[in-house]
Amino acid sequence: IWELKKDVYVVELDWYPDAPGEMVVLTCDTPEEDGITWTLDQSSEVLGSGKTLTIQVKEFGDAGQYTCHKGGEVLSHSLLLLHKKEDGIWSTDILKDQKEPKNKTFLRCEAKNYSGRFTCWWLTTISTDLTFSVKSSRGSSDPQGVTCGAATLSAERVRGDNKEYEYSVECQEDSACPAAEESLPIEVMVDAVHKLKYENYTSSFFIRDIIKPDPPKNLQLKPLKNSRQVEVSWEYPDTWSTPHSYFSLTFCVQVQGKSKREKKDRVFTDKTSATVICRKNASISVRAQDRYYSSSWSEWASVPCS
Amino acid sequence: RNLPVATPDPGMFPCLHHSQNLLRAVSNMLQKARQTLEFYPCTSEEIDHEDITKDKTSTVEACLPLELTKNESCLNSRETSFITNGSCLASRKTSFMMALCLSSIYEDLKMYQVEFKTMNAKLLMDPKRQIFLDQNMLAVIDELMQALNFNSETVPQKSSLEEPDFYKTKIKLCILLHAFRIRAVTIDRVMSYLNAS
């Protein structure tokens, strides 16, 4: 048993049929010595008396809010949550496996630049009685500070009968230098509590590996005289690290016809303009990637050819 | 030692070209190592991230773009600060810092070159003959060092008397390649920045 926060405790249980469970001793936080009784949740049934209560925790029915009273007055509470371990593996029932970039990916994180700010998100099918708390640090043995906000529900997605909820959190490394060479990874820890079930999820990464720039901005076309060619120009996204001559991007320009079957023309360039042939009903798209460290491409910015 | 002249002249451009070749070569070599040594801990997640230049050179700090010198987090480990007379930079100071930057890059390359050559000598003794260092990568390191044009004492190749542990050598190769790739990214950024200014 360990304390998650004040008056909230997590009991770690090996979860298999007829498991013996864990013996837990609760102590009433009071100077009083006699006349103390214990109840669980909303029930008025007295579970025991005295300053301490010894219980055998085996299943979710044994978890919940234990309250000690004296003469009708509440003295203190202890909330017991369960953390299940099945076949030596901690349960991951609350969050959905996103399977990207690999199986058992519950948390995904992205950064728009090298400022030390990043966003993590996760999915669940659970809609109520759910709380998350997020902690993060740079390195684990001698951790350096990363500050995370509160996790918020950002989206609901419905696919037929299935509803999933997306939560996200923003974190900022306390003293980040965009030019630094990372040698210790960022660690992100998410505590998830659904009703009386506790689970924790972790992710470890270097900012350089989770970079995904915003799409290029101000995508414009300029037709070239007496030609089917156009000059496409764009700018670095506002959110990208500066100076741009140090934090350079490379770009992919794509011309795509209306039908998916039509051949796509692709050009790669380090410049912020390119000359392409604009076909009728086609669209021109541009995306960006760090020029020197191949992390993710941005989403596409697109304009119609016409 | 000859300090390079700090005027962004056409002489900077070959360095940019060589640094791009360097990044390409080390990235290819790392990819090859990850594929060939697939049953060894050779991915970014599996290895310890060591920097053989730590406490010996200060490339990131010495080559910091001017725009980032206002960032306290970038300055806290610097012995030499760009900032003089408030936020004004004297041109002599700028050229001195650029010389410091380029000489630091040169020292990095020299250190990695020695390590890689020593390692290759060990790998050539491996009866499995599983992996060797790409000669192109070693040549590119050499070309960039020549383009940087420093006169420096030659560091003798480390020789080891004991029997090499090939498993450890291959893991060390992965660690070195990961670290060198990160440093090659920094060098490329620096050359691009200097070329633009």
Partner: nanobody, 117 residues
Framework: QVQLVESGGGLVQPGGSLRLSCAAS????????MGWYRQAPGKQREIVAT???????NIADSVKGRFIISRDFVKNTVALQMNSLKPEDTAVYYC???????????WGPGTQVTVSS
């Protein structure tokens, strides 16, 4: 091309809530991304929230924790639940969709949201 129709705009007091809805029609299979942008008088159109068929929802910092985007992949609808509204949320809200990652955006005609006491 996709046709988009918004509904649910109106006048609301500061601190109040509104729900905007948008339905897509036309020759569509699965739409890659749907979402909402807004344009306040004299300002540029800005992102509010967009949600792709997979990957991360993009929510503007200014509305994080107050607005929730909901998307139904079968009905091809998107909704925006706006809570704790502020006067600075006053704008014309536009529904937005892209059939594929590289296709050009389609826009609805817009719906006015006014937050005022």
């Amino acid at each position: 091309q996709v046709q988009l129709v918004e509904s649910g705009g109106g006048l609301v007091q500061p601190g109040g809530s509104l729900r905007l809805s948008c339905a897509a029609s036309g020759s569509i299979a699965e739409i890659y991304v749907m979402g909402w942008y807004r344009q306040a008088p004299g300002k540029q159109r800005e992102i509010v929230a967009t949600t792709p068929s997979s990957g991360r929802t993009n929510i503007a910092d200014s509305v994080k924790g107050r607005f929730i985007i909901s998307r139904d992949f079968v009905k091809n609808t998107v909704a925006l639940q706006m809570n704790s509204l502020k006067p600075e949320d006053t704008a014309v809200y536009y529904c937005y969709a892209r059939l594929t990652p590289t296709s050009v955006a389609s826009w609805g005609p817009g719906t006015q949201v006014t937050v005022s006491s």
